[in-house]
Interface confidence: low
Amino acid sequence: SPEVWVQVQMEATNLSSFSVHCGVLGYSLISLVTVSCEGFVDAGRTKLAVLHPEFGTQQWAPARQAHWETPNSVSVTLTMGQSKARSSLANTTFCCEFVTFPHGSRVACRDLHRSDPGLSAPTPALNLQAD
């Protein structure tokens, strides 16, 4: 069964811009990826981007760019006001949902806490089999 990972990276010199990276480990046939967050813009879950491997991507503010990094991982770049970023990131959870064949939907989320050094998760080893 595939395992989904989530990583968040923020530029040390620019707190208003950061990116969410997520992917699935193992050989998977991905039909849809949805990246969302909770507690970032308003209450409830906010859809940031939807990526389809053939039909393209959709993104919504504050997502500025969404793209496939590898055949099994995606990246979403977000931009917002510095003060808003500082105040709300501590309460934010980013979630990535991968719809894969034949396993169905798999979701992973990452909470951001003030104690997270650099608000960045450790980078997982990409052990993907197919191109």
């Epitope: 050989y27 046939l29 039909s31 491997p53 053939e54 590898t70 055949p71 099994n72 064949f101 034949p102 080893a125 990409l126 052990n127 993907l128 089999q129 197919a130 191109d131």
Partner: antibody, heavy 122, light 106 residues
Framework: EVQLVESGGGLVQPGRSLRLSCTAS????????MSWFRQAPGKGLEWVGF??????????EYTASVKGRFTISRDGSKSIAYLQMNSLKTEDTAVYYC?????????????WGQGTTVTVSS | DIQMTQSPSSLSASVGDRVTITCRAS??????LNWYQQKPGKAPKLLIY???SLQSGVPSRFSGSGSGTDFTLTISSLQPEDFATYYC????????FGGGTKVEIK
């Protein structure tokens, strides 16, 4: 010309080992996963396993009947994929093919080698 | 594992005939299905990928259709070079093939 050439087949006794090579040319080898298949005499095609491209870690996956006995590896500097076969059984007798892929979107194997014959017999 | 069942296992046809080969998966595989042609003593050749997309360089008389569990390979007008064995293959690991369909000269 995009090409795959297998070598290393032959007659081997049960329990022994054999290493097959698949030499690639005409494309950027590191960008592609590489698969191995086999076909027993008069039978259909069977997937053996594959190894990921350089960018995605080069990890491997195998069919159940060869897991723990067969190992797929690759040498990017030589553009060669290997199939190391240990503890061979008579039922491993087949023509072995290497192929390029599977690829994203298509998941098909679009380039195949000519095959090399492995006979496991005492 | 997903089982692939091809039918018929063999068929006899004449040049110019329309030939249809079917492949059934034991569970839904969406459109993750490929078709290959293999001639005696030769390696397989990819004809159709993703159920219905024609591989580059393959004649347009070959076509594929279907999704879910039922798929079809059609040769609209059989040519002398088309006499071969045809295999379907699904793309979820472990990758599995149908048993093959041998197309022979009537």
């Amino acid at each position: 010309e995009v090409q795959l050439v297998e070598s290393g087949g032959g007659l081997v006794q049960p329990g022994r080992s054999l290493r097959l090579s698949c030499t690639a040319s005409g494309f950027t080898f590191g960008d592609y996963a590489m698969s191995w298949f086999r076909q027993a005499p008069g039978k259909g095609l069977e997937w053996v396993g594959f190894i990921g491209s350089k960018a995605y870690g080069g990890t491997t996956e195998y069919t159940a009947s060869v897991k723990g006995r067969f190992t797929i590896s690759r040498d990017g500097s030589k553009s060669i994929a290997y199939l190391q076969m240990n503890s061979l059984k008579t039922e491993d007798t087949a023509v072995y093919y290497c192929a390029r892929g599977p690829r994203r979107y298509t998941y098909g194997m679009d380039v195949w080698g000519q095959g090399t014959t492995v006979t496991v017999s005492s | 594992d997903i089982q692939m069942t091809q039918s018929p296992s063999s068929l006899s046809a004449s040049v110019g005939d329309r030939v249809t080969i079917t492949c059934r998966a034991s569970q839904s595989i969406s459109s993750y299905l490929n078709w290959y042609q293999q001639k005696p003593g030769k390696a397989p050749k990819l004809l159709i990928y993703a159920a219905s997309s024609l591989q580059s360089g393959v004649p347009s008389r070959f076509s594929g259709s279907g999704s879910g569990t039922d798929f079809t390979l059609t040769i609209s007008s059989l040519q002398p070079e088309d006499f071969a064995t045809y295999y379907c293959q699904q793309s979820s690991t472990p990758l599995t093939f149908g048993g093959g369909t041998k197309v022979e000269i009537k």
